[in-house]
Every structure is written in structure tokens, then in C-alpha cells.
């Protein structure tokens, strides 16, 4: 199957790479603008320069283009705990990330929130915290995993999943009590 091309893609495909078809005269191929610039005026004729202007502060283009306006720079979402990794330049958007010992949790394709990595207190790190994934913990004997934290088996109620994990501990306590009464 041939992918469906949009009007602009159809027009561009007529011209060699790095050029685009003049919107008013389809016999003219104009040179695209470099990244960091935008199209101010189309080239007046074949072999003549396209009028490209540098993006103003707060805007960018990251690839060669024939956009009439530069794109607005993204802002890092402070309410999501995001920090600026690198500032916006004329040819690159702002890069946002998380602080050290935090991971990104994505709510949508482009929206992420920063959370602290679990520390695995009373346990060991099974899988280290990664850019987009929290630490995976395993717990020491006498502790069970609840909400990715190691909780003492003394907090294990019979109805919870932890009864399986804490069973040896419970048995040991029971055994000690039994041996003490004989």
C-alpha cells in the first residue's frame, strides 16, 4: 500500500531534497530554510535565494523547513517537578527532565511527572531506578513488599497477600512459643 501523502508532501516531492515547490509557481523550486530560521519570503525565481530569517528569542526550528513562523519553545512543567536540562536555542527546543534520584512517569506521550526513586530500605535493589522506571525492590527476611516499600512482617494481617511471604517468620514465632511451653 502506498501511504497517503498530504498536499505539502506531494508538492515537496516534485523538488529535489532540500528544496520545496513555490506555492504560487509550481515550476520553481526554492531552497528550504536552515534550522534556526524560518521562511520570510519565497525565492523570487529559479536559482535565487529564499528569504529566511533567524528565529526570535523564545522560538526555534529544529530542522530545515519552509515554515512561516518558528515554533514556540516548550516550558518545563514546574508543577510536575520538571527541571530544565538545556535551554531553548534557535535550533533546538527546551529539554526538560527530572532531578537526580528521580524518574519520569508519563501520563501521556508528551507529559511526564517526576517522582523520587524508591530507596529499598529494609531490602535490596533488584532493578535500579531508570529514567522512566522506578526502582524494583526485594525485601530482607522479616519484611514484605507493599507499595514498593519493605514493611515489617509484624504489620502483616492474615487476610493480606503478605501471609505467604511472612509465613516462615510467623511459623518461627509459633515454633519458639511452642518450644517454650514444653
Amino acid at each position: 500500500l502506498v501511504p497517503h501523502l498530504g498536499d505539502r508532501e506531494k508538492r515537496d516531492s516534485v523538488c529535489p531534497q532540500g528544496k520545496y515547490i513555490h506555492p504560487q509557481n509550481n515550476s520553481i523550486c526554492c531552497t528550504k530554510c536552515h534550522k534556526g530560521t524560518y521562511l520570510y519570503n519565497d525565492c523570487p525565481g529559479p536559482g535565487q535565494d529564499t528569504d529566511c530569517r533567524e528565529c526570535e528569542s523564545g522560538s526555534f526550528t529544529a530542522s530545515e523547513n519552509h515554515l512561516r513562523h518558528c515554533l514556540s519553545c516548550s516550558k518545563c512543567r514546574k508543577e510536575m517537578g520538571q527541571v530544565e536540562i538545556s535551554s531553548c536555542t534557535v535550533d533546538r527546543d527546551t529539554v526538560c527532565g527530572c532531578r537526580k534520584n528521580q524518574y519520569r512517569h508519563y501520563w501521556s506521550e508528551n507529559l511526564f511527572q517526576c517522582f523520587n526513586c524508591s530507596l529499598c530500605l529494609n531490602g535490596t535493589v533488584h532493578l535500579s531506578c531508570q529514567e522512566k522506571q522506578n526502582t524494583v525492590c526485594t525485601c530482607h527476611a522479616g519484611f514484605f513488599l507493599r507499595e514498593n516499600e519493605c514493611v515489617s512482617c509484624s504489620n502483616c494481617k492474615k487476610s493480606l497477600e503478605c501471609t505467604k511471604l511472612c509465613l516462615p517468620q510467623i511459623e518461627n514465632v509459633k515454633g519458639t512459643e511452642d518450644s517454650g511451653t514444653t
Partner: nanobody, 116 residues
Framework: EVQLLESGGGLVQPGGSLRLSCAAS????????MAWVRQAPGKGLEWVST????????YYADSVKGRFTISRDNSKNTLYLQMNSLRAEDTAVYYC?????????WGQGTLVTVSS
């Protein structure tokens, strides 16, 4: 299979209250931060509030701060959103969200209409 089922929406007058619930299944609920997002008619998705996996930490969009309260009951695999002092601009379909990926999907949402 991940399932998120929102409920509790409805028609309410400005200044009124509603409590939304989201019943989760198909994943280990207590290990995941959860969020409420909303989509007003003809608009894009807007993040409303987040709660950490333990429920200790909560986060709110400026537009709802002081009016909405997010909470969770990990023993019941349920997420809640208490909405007070509702305004016309809170009218939207409300979704509870887990983690975005190409496989997970959100529930069908619950419609909240604030109108006199």
C-alpha cells in the same frame, strides 16, 4: 488486561460538589502513581491531579488547587477525586490515568457538567 472504570459524574450547579471514583484492575494498583485528567468540550486533555503510589504525596493543577482533593484506597484498588466549589469551567469528561504506553488505555471517562 488493564481496566480503569470511572464513575460519579453528573449534572451539578455551580458551587456544588461531586465525588468521582475509579475502579482499577489488571495491574498492581498500589505500585503505580495515579492521576485524574480531563477534557473539556472541544479542547485538549488537561492534567488535573496526581497521587503517589502510597498516597502520601498529592499534586494539583493551579486551576483546581484548594477545591479538589485526590485520594486512593489501595486495599480497594480505587482512586477518588472529591470536587468542591465546582465552576462552569470544570465541565469536562474526567478520566483516571495510570501510565501512558502504547498498550495501556484509559477508561471511558465520566462526564461532569456544571450548569445552573
Amino acid at each position: 488486561e488493564v481496566q480503569l472504570l470511572e464513575s460519579g459524574g453528573g449534572l451539578v450547579q455551580p458551587g456544588g460538589s461531586l465525588r468521582l471514583s475509579c475502579a482499577a484492575s489488571g495491574f498492581t494498583f498500589g505500585y503505580e502513581p495515579m492521576a485524574w485528567v480531563r477534557q473539556a468540550p472541544g479542547k485538549g486533555l488537561e492534567w488535573v491531579s496526581t497521587i503517589s503510589h502510597t498516597g502520601r504525596d498529592t499534586y494539583y493543577a493551579d486551576s483546581v488547587k484548594g477545591r479538589f482533593t485526590i485520594s486512593r484506597d489501595n486495599s480497594k484498588n480505587t482512586l477518588y477525586l472529591q470536587m468542591n466549589s465546582l465552576r462552569a469551567e470544570d465541565t469536562a469528561v474526567y478520566y483516571c490515568a495510570k501510565r501512558w504506553s502504547s498498550f495501556d488505555y484509559w477508561g471511558q471517562g465520566t462526564l461532569v457538567t456544571v450548569s445552573s
